[in-house]
């Protein structure tokens, strides 16, 4: 793709806005960032040339106050102050507040439930395929294949705990070694970060909100990818994770523990089990080459079964094939032996919607996938709306200060580590990193949490999910205890190693810079977000998987030139920004490349042309659909019947410089008015959150 898009005739300058640069630019040049954001889909605005690095002046006609797009929006309060209200108004406001809280909790509940059902849907659609990925024998010898299988399977089943439990059962059945399982676990760590990235896509309707949300979500992706990039080669070379975890497992005489506490599941399960119930064992059975499992449905039909262990007599070719020498005989014609069989008698059917439909897994999965995405999107929109109306004025100030402020000097450095602990604790409570990071995403989007604070919370979430796995491992039956514990510890130490790499020294916090860079690109070219998702979570893993199947020679033959080109581009980029004078004039910028190789603009034109045919027919009967439309078309004008994006763009057109809606308005309520989402009169009666 474009190494550093839209550089035009500019001299390399690290301080200027580069569309692809994953860095935090200084504040002054950032003023030009938004200006550069407008393209052919928007109103003409003052274009800014990127000036040479030796220039001392930036001659731009623009308003003096344009914020850094990464600064949190000021959520001002437009409502009548509490002190100015009469008793009736105060009571009304109090109940409004309670009502909002109940609604918020309700939508949050359905948001979490929809994530659970989304995971089930993915398992129904791709679970069996995921199981078959595991049965590939090359995993043993090819760590790269193990890695991409971990990614693909986790993306397909939308749950790292499912893919990890398959790995555990394969290790305890000696179908996989711990050494071969480690890259799969690393891949599962990457795969699990897709969920909050999908959630971030739901906030596409508002460029600025989307920029923050998408960056906040992808900080998790970049952390995981970068950790793997460094730690997988280290593990292959030294086997440090395997050795450390083996020492720990062998030094303790573990007794089987209690089951890991299901805290959030206790609340969500009563609802989700009414929608669908899955027999997760089927995926594991497929992974373990059980032929019968391939024809089994993942949809659980019988919930109450009676299992009776009995001995049955079975014929064997000869008495040498007897299961037990003492239980062997002939009737003169056939040879018989006694076999212990578990006879399963179905007693009661499960109580869920799909129990009597007898639909194929793919059909059930597709239905649930669509419905859960709609519910997820709807809940997210409502959560953002409610939070927007609640988090204003004093409340917003307090919350933002509490979450984003550091400890006083000299303990400021401890704040991030506390955030890691909070992230780990919260994830342990909700029993899912996906749920925690997905809940965090809209908060980053609306500007309650900064990316700098979201980063340690996400890292903590990665740790939290492994502590859950360790507890689950301790509750495993005897034969699986060692392997499941060792794998859970590998997962834990992998995340710890990642944190040590990409957190303690601020300079090494590359994931933040990369995520912000991607956030900037995706805010301008919203289709790029989908492109990123497909490339990183599907195409790259599938390509590596395909090349690995073709043999290591093919993998090396294709991989080495690709890696070489990437390194070359990175080195060139570094030299261009740090010391361009050492480079020949031609290489001091990217102008020697054709436009399509250095800018997303031509690609944007292609995407716009490609999606143009949908624009007229784009059915926008609801805002959910409109957001999807905005994402695909990158042209909100297609949504004529819904004003979710249109008026916002019109508001932007009126400005000299592109505006980050809705932050530039005095408060969220007014910005929503501008988008046609809230009647103008509503802001008068808006009450300050208590």
């Amino acid at each position: 793709m474009a190494p550093w898009p839209e550089l035009g005739d500019a001299q390399p300058n690290p301080d200027k806005y580069l569309e692809g640069a994953a860095g935090q630019q200084p504040t002054a040049p950032d003023k030009s960032k938004e200006t550069n954001k407008t393209d052919n889909t928007e109103a003409p605005v003052t274009k800014i040339e990127l000036l040479p690095s030796y220039s001392t002046a930036t001659l731009i006609d623009e308003p003096t106050e344009v914020d850094d797009p990464w600064n949190l929006p000021t959520l001002q309060d437009s409502g009548i102050k509490w002190s100015e209200r009469d008793t009736k108004g105060k009571i009304l406001c109090f109940f409004q507040g309670i009502g909002r809280l109940i609604l918020l909790l309700g939508f949050l509940y359905f948001f979490v439930c929809s994530l659970d059902i989304l995971s089930s849907a993915f398992q129904l659609v791709g679970g069996k395929m995921a199981g078959q990925f595991f049965s590939n024998s090359s995993i043993m010898s090819n760590p790269l294949l193990g890695l991409v299988i971990g990614v693909l399977v986790t993306v397909l089943v939308q749950s790292s705990s499912t893919s990890t439990s398959i790995v555990v059962s394969m290790v305890s059945s000696s179908l996989l070694t711990v050494r071969a399982a480690i890259p799969i676990i690393m891949g599962a760590n990457i795969g699990t970060s897709i969920t909050n990235t999908i959630v971030a896509l739901m906030q596409v309707g508002d460029r600025s909100e989307f920029r923050r949300a998408f960056a906040g979500a992808t900080v998790h992706d970049f952390f995981n990818w970068l950790s793997v990039l460094v730690l997988l080669p280290v593990e292959v070379a030294t086997h440090y994770l395997e050795i450390i975890t083996q020492l720990i497992v062998e030094s303790f005489h573990f007794k089987n523990g209690e089951d890991a506490p299901d805290l959030l599941k206790v609340i969500t399960k009563p609802f989700t089990k009414l929608i669908v119930q899955l027999d997760k064992k089927v995926i594991s059975q497929i992974a373990m080459n059980d032929e019968k499992a391939k024809n089994k449905s993942l949809v659980k039909i019988w919930c109450k079964t009676f299992t009776n262990k009995t001995q049955i007599n079975v014929t064997v070719p000869s008495t040498a094939n007897c299961t037990s020498p003492s239980l062997c005989w002939t009737d003169g014609i056939q040879n018989w032996t006694m076999k212990n069989v578990t006879y399963k008698e179905n007693i009661a059917k499960c109580q869920h919607i799909f129990v009597n439909f007898h639909l194929p897994d793919l059909a059930v999965g597709t239905i649930l996938l669509i419905l859960s995405l709609l519910v997820l999107c709807g809940c997210l929109i409502m959560i953002v709306k409610i939070l927007g109306s609640v988090l204003k004025g004093q409340v917003a100030t307090v919350i933002k200060k509490t979450i984003n402020t550091d400890f006083p000097f000299p303990f400021a450095w401890l704040t991030g580590y506390l955030a890691i602990l909070v992230g780990a604790g919260m994830t342990f409570i909700v029993q899912s990193s996906s749920v925690f990071t997905s809940a965090l995403t809209p908060l980053i989007g609306i500007g309650v949490i900064t990316i700098e604070r979201a980063y340690p919370l996400t890292l903590g979430s990665n740790i939290g999910t492994t502590t859950t796995a360790i507890l689950a491992a301790l509750a495993s039956p005897g034969n699986a205890l060692r392997s499941s514990l060792q794998i859970a510890l590998c997962h834990f130490f992998f995340n710890i190693s990642g944190i040590l790499l990409w957190y303690p020294i601020p300079f090494t916090r590359l994931p933040i810079r990369m995520a912000k860079g991607l956030g900037n690109i995706s805010a301008k070219y919203r289709w790029f977000a989908v492109f990123y998702l497909i490339i990183f979570f599907f195409l790259i893993p599938l390509t590596v998987f395909g090349l690995s199947l073709a043999g290591w020679r093919v993998l090396v033959g294709v991989g080495v030139p690709v890696v070489f080109i990437i390194i070359l581009v990175l080195c060139l980029r570094l030299l261009q920004s740090r010391c361009p004078r050492v480079l020949p004039k031609k290489l001091q910028n990217w102008n020697f490349l054709p436009l399509w190789m250095r800018s997303l603009k031509p690609w944007d034109a292609v995407v716009s042309k490609f999606t143009g045919c949908f624009q007229m027919r784009c059915c926008c009967c609801c805002r959910v659909c409109c957001r999807a439309c905005c994402l695909l078309c990158d042209c909100p004008k297609c949504c004529r019947c819904s004003k979710c994006c249109e008026d916002l763009e019109e508001a932007q057109e009126g400005q000299d410089v592109p505006v980050k809606a809705p932050e530039t308005f005095d408060n969220i309520t007014i910005s929503r008015e501008a988008q046609g989402e809230v009647p103008a009169s509503d802001s008068k009666t808006e009450c300050t959150a208590l």
Epitope: T315, T319, P325, S326, W329, T330, G332, Q334, N335
Partner: antibody, heavy 120, light 107 residues
């Protein structure tokens, strides 16, 4: 009650064949294997072979192979044992016995026996 | 074929005596051994199967034991109606083979 009724005594010339029948009643014929056991005068018991009536699978003792044929007719719940190329040493009492298929209970019920005398 | 050797070939005992008949297999047969009783001029009748399981209707004075290669049929208290020839049979592998028989008489 369970009964295995065999055909009457036979006197045969050497080189000829004999076909003994065994009619079952009082149980599900197809759930059992029908075995044939012979006992020469003053001697012990010798297993000859057997048949599974519901699929006509048979097995014979090596020294009878080629000379003995065991068949069964499900419709009449009758098993047959035909021994060809008779020799004087084939003079014996021939018993049919049932054995519960897929079970290790051995021959739990026997026919009354058919005496076959081979003499010139 | 597995050979089944019974001993003694005949025995004489008084009513009420404890009688033991042994049967030795030429190779391991597990517990796949049956015992039959054949009274003079009558058809054989199943007494014990699976080395020690009494067939329905068989008096409790008859018991079987053993596994592997050595098996025993015991009549705890000999009765006049127990006069018969007793055969052991292995059904571990085909062909099914019988012991030579043990003739039990009353003194």
């Amino acid at each position: 009650q369970v009964q295995l009724v065999q055909s009457g005594a036979e006197v045969k010339k050497p080189g000829s064949s004999v076909k003994v029948s065994c009619k079952a009643s009082g149980f599900f014929f197809t759930e059992y294997i029908i075995h044939w056991v012979r006992q020469a005068p003053g001697q012990g018991l010798e297993w000859m072979g057997g048949i599974i009536p519901n699929n006509d699978v048979t097995n014979y003792k090596q020294n009878f192979r080629g000379r003995v044929t065991i068949t069964a007719d499900e419709s009449t719940s009758t098993a047959y044992m035909e021994l060809s190329s008779l020799r004087s040493e084939d003079t014996a009492v021939y018993y049919c016995a049932r054995w519960r298929n897929a079970y290790y209970s051995a021959m739990d019920s026997w026919g009354q026996g058919t005496t076959v005398t081979v003499s010139s | 074929d597995i050979q089944m050797t019974q001993s003694p070939s005949s025995l004489s005992a008084s009513v009420g005596d404890r009688v033991t008949i042994t049967c030795t297999a030429s190779q391991d047969v597990g517990t796949a051994v049956a015992w039959y009783q054949q009274k003079p001029g009558k058809v054989p009748k199943l007494l014990i199967y699976w080395a020690s399981t009494r067939h329905t209707g068989v008096p409790s004075r008859f018991s079987g034991s053993g596994s592997g290669t050595d098996f025993t049929l015991t009549i705890s208290s000999l009765q006049p109606e127990d006069v018969a020839t007793y055969y052991c049979q292995q059904y571990r592998t085909s062909p099914l083979t019988f012991g030579g028989g043990t003739k039990v008489e009353i003194k």
